[in-house]
């Protein structure tokens, strides 16, 4: 029951996390323009992974996508890649985990198969969460670097004078969404991995013991062997116990489905 709850909760947490990673990736507010020391206070600028937007106090918003001719920094491309990899891995993980859920029966799927699928999806969620956290952190580092490097200057450009106004970009809402979402996906993945341990059937290699009916010497056989059917070769009427006798370290183990007298 606890295993099912852990697996189910892990799935739900990861689902919320991946939805958050998708939302963060699509959001425009990765960086917001700090209007301190800016003469155009009626206008607010924010930039995302895909486009830059200008919003006015009147409510008017205009967004423009980034074009390759602008020479986008490699770091931005890296962040895009990390977020997309995170989404893809998370989506595959979700698909795998649906079939791995203990509460869902698909044909005669073995518990061992479900355990493997749970572990696989768990690892995928962990990597997905780490990708998102890494992507958001790289972008945050870019902002911090940009914040301290921004300066005001003046120069003559094509067609006239050009002034650079000191505009600083600060953390946008998408960064916090990304961090939280990545963390949730990571937690969900860990929960799936924990659930996997409970799902996996414990394989026990019992030391079989053969007893003579006459009560003479007991022959201990070090390895497990096939239980006799009671016909054919077992002519001396030996009682065969597959795991009938157990060593001390095996007392805690669960009985095998082959245990019989």
């Amino acid at each position: 029951m606890a295993v099912t709850a852990c697996q189910g909760l892990g799935f739900v947490v990861s689902l919320i996390g991946i939805a958050g990673i998708i939302a963060a990736t699509c959001m425009d507010q990765w960086s917001t323009q700090d209007l301190y020391n800016n003469p155009v206070t009626a206008v607010f600028n924010y930039q995302g992974l895909w486009r830059s937007c200008v919003r006015e106090s009147s409510g008017f918003t205009e967004c423009r996508g980034y074009f390759t001719l602008l020479g986008l920094p490699a770091m931005l491309q890296a962040v895009r890649a990390l977020m997309i990899v995170g989404i893809v891995l998370g989506a595959i993980g979700l698909l795998v985990s649906i079939f791995a859920l203990k509460c869902i029966r698909i044909g005669s799927m073995e518990d061992s198969a479900k355990a493997n699928m749970t572990l696989t999806s768990g690892i995928m969620f962990i990597v997905s969460g780490l990708c998102a956290i890494a992507g958001v952190s790289v972008f945050a580092n870019m902002l911090v670097t940009n914040f301290w490097m921004s300066t005001a200057n003046m120069y003559t450009g094509m067609g006239g004078m050009v002034q650079t106004v000191q505009t600083r970009y600060t953390f946008g809402a998408a960064l916090f969404v990304g961090w939280v979402a990545g963390g949730l996906t990571l937690i969900g993945g860990v929960m799936m991995c924990i659930a996997c341990r409970g799902l996996a059937p414990e394989e026990t290699n019992y030391k079989a013991v053969s007893y003579h009916a006459s009560g003479h010497s007991v022959a201990y056989k070090p390895g497990g062997f096939k239980a006799s059917t009671g016909f054919g070769s077992n002519t001396k009427n030996k009682k065969i116990y597959d795991g009938g006798a157990r060593t001390e370290d095996e007392v805690q183990s669960y009985p095998s489905k082959h245990d019989y007298v």
């Epitope: 200008v54 006015e56 986008l72 920094p73 006239g160 650079t164 505009t167």
Partner: nanobody, 121 residues
């Protein structure tokens, strides 16, 4: 590189009209505001009118009611319709655009080369 190109300047009689236009070309992300400033001989450059992309306009008291600023967002062009011109409107009219050039880049204020407007009495 961003370029501002003005056109429409010239000589006009007092009471006459003139229309200035300014087109922004080049590679940039966003135009924040566009406007017109003027500089009469021996004087400081002063604001005439500005407009945001959303249509919020601002005029100097000396031109209110006579000048009209308008824009074409699709063409990245700003216009200044000047009516009831006076000799004191004689100046070099400069086009201005506040631009965000690229990703995480600082706001840049671009100026045109200027268009001469002369109002004769």
């Amino acid at each position: 590189q961003v370029k501002l190109e003005e056109s429409g300047g010239g000589l006009v009689q007092a009471g006459g009209s003139l229309r200035l236009s300014c087109a922004v070309s080049g590679n940039f992300l966003n135009i924040v505001t566009m406007g017109w400033y003027r500089q009469a001989p021996g004087k400081q450059r002063e604001l005439v009118a500005t407009t945001t992309r959303g249509g919020t306009t601002n005029y100097s008291d000396s031109v209110k009611g006579r000048f009209t600023i308008s824009r074409d967002n699709a063409k990245n062009t700003v216009y200044l319709q000047m009516n009831s011109l006076k000799p004191e409107d004689t100046a070099v009219y400069y086009c201005n655009a506040d631009i965000i050039p690229g990703f995480l880049q600082q706001l840049t204020v671009h100026w045109g080369q200027g268009a001469q407007v002369t109002v004769s009495s």
